[in-house]
Interface confidence: medium
């Protein structure tokens, strides 16, 4: 029992020293590109960090396969409604995998935050939060998209963010 017990203790200690992959990315002035691509994120300043995950052009890149809790919140707001706004705004987390040519929907929400019928002077606020556990392989990527991104408010790194951690 003694040697087996000490072996288990050693394994536990080793596990506790292994760093679970985690990242929290925050909204920045450069997040909204207007190009139709995914949102871009701050990875280093303020509350943002990357640990055991990498980042590339808006995407969190998985380096270690496993189950991950992924999440994103976007703060929406405006004065009246932007011209050309679709009837709904889609906020989604999407997976890119080398095994498939198109992005795959992971978590998606739809909002109708500002009705065109209201007065154009109406200041409004809304938000969308997504979070869930998904399995990701090494090399796969997760991105955030918002259509219409013009409604995303970024003022500081606390309102709109994107992250993941291995569970």
């Amino acid at each position: 029992d003694g040697p087996a017990g000490s072996w288990e203790q050693l394994i536990q200690e080793r596990r506790s020293h292994e760093v679970n992959p985690a990242a929290h990315l925050t909204g920045a002035n450069s997040s909204l590109t207007g190009s139709g691509g995914p949102l871009l994120w701050e990875t280093q300043l303020g509350l943002a960090f990357l640990r055991g995950l990498s980042y590339h052009d808006g995407a969190l890149v998985v380096t270690k396969a496993g189950y991950y809790y992924i999440y994103s919140k976007v703060q929406l707001g405006g004065v009246g409604c932007p011209l050309g706004l679709a009837s709904t705004i889609t906020h989604g987390l999407y997976k890119r995998t080398p095994r498939y040519p198109e992005e795959l929907e992971l978590l998606v929400s739809q909002q109708s935050p500002c009705g065109r019928a209201t007065s154009s002077s109406r200041v409004w606020w809304d938000s969308s939060f997504l979070g869930g556990v998904v399995h990701l392989e090494a090399g796969e990527e997760v991105v955030v998209r918002v259509l219409d991104e013009r409604l995303v408010r970024l003022r500081d790194g606390t309102r709109s963010y994107f992250g993941a951690f291995m569970v």
Epitope: G78, V79, G80, P82, G84, V123, R153
Partner: antibody, heavy 121, light 111 residues
Framework: QVQLVQSGAEVKKPGASVKVSCKAS????????VHWVRQAPGQGLEWMGA????????SYNQKFKGRATLTADKSTSTAYMELSSLRSEDTAVYYC??????????????WGQGTLVTVSS | DIVLTQSPDSLAVSLGERATINCKAS??????????MNWYQQKPGQPPKLLIY???NLESGIPDRFSGSGSGTDFTLTISSLQAEDVAVYYC?????????FGQGTKVEIK
């Protein structure tokens, strides 16, 4: 470079209609609003409305609603402003202008050269 | 509608001197830390030209002698050292709500 080229000067009789065109180049036409602003001789600037070429959505100054029609043709990257039931006080230079991508903070960063519309009997 | 009142209506300034134009809105044009006020320059026979957007941001290609400041209802356009080519009419414009409105204009001349 971004360019907005408007159609030529028009002389119209009271009660008639006029249609001014604004051909855009140098940017993605469907991603930016096109606004129309007029300026009577020796006077200030007056916003008439805007069109979003991506889906044809429009917003009008109530003063012109029912008399002005704003449209956009994606195939030719051209925006149009039609004003009906013309009266002498509609004599003005009519400008098209590109609005910024963010509508709520819509500043006009590129302007057409202007089209003089004269309404006279 | 939001009414913008500029002062003065006209301004004569010596070359190299500072010119200051004020614009007062009938209600606040602030939202989420931004002020939706813009400034344009118009020379005779030409369309207006964007100088400053969202109160204090200098449009690319505009000389840095132009600056904008203010928030809420009170805004200022400053030309730090007037040049001959700055002779024009200057307009403020709010984009907080439609109908977007302009001030009546301020004519800047050389003294």
């Amino acid at each position: 470079q971004v360019q907005l080229v408007q159609s030529g000067a028009e002389v119209k009789k009271p009660g008639a209609s006029v249609k001014v065109s604004c051909k855009a180049s140098g940017y993605t036409f469907t991603s930016y609003n096109v606004h129309w602003v007029r300026q009577a001789p020796g006077q200030g600037l007056e916003w008439m409305g805007a069109v979003y070429p991506g889906n044809g959505d429009t917003s009008y100054n109530q003063k012109f609603k029912g008399r002005a029609t704003l449209t956009a043709d994606k195939s030719t990257s051209t925006a149009y402003m039609e004003l009906s039931s013309l009266r002498s006080e509609d004599t003005a230079v009519y400008y098209c202008a590109r609005g910024s991508y963010y509508y709520t903070s819509s500043y006009f960063d590129h302007w057409g050269q202007g089209t003089l519309v004269t309404v006279s009997s | 509608d939001i009414v913008l009142t500029q002062s003065p209506d006209s301004l004569a300034v010596s070359l190299g001197e500072r010119a200051t134009i004020n614009c007062k809105a009938s209600q606040s044009v602030d939202f989420d830390g931004d002020s939706y006020m813009n400034w344009y320059q118009q020379k005779p026979g030409q369309p207006p030209k964007l100088l400053i957007y969202t109160a204090s941001n200098l449009e690319s290609g505009i000389p840095d002698r132009f600056s904008g400041s203010g928030s809420g209802t009170d805004f200022t356009l400053t030309i730090s050292s007037l040049q001959a080519e700055d002779v024009a009419v200057y307009y403020c414009q709010q984009s907080y709500e439609d109908p977007f409105t302009f001030g009546q204009g301020t004519k800047v001349e050389i003294k």
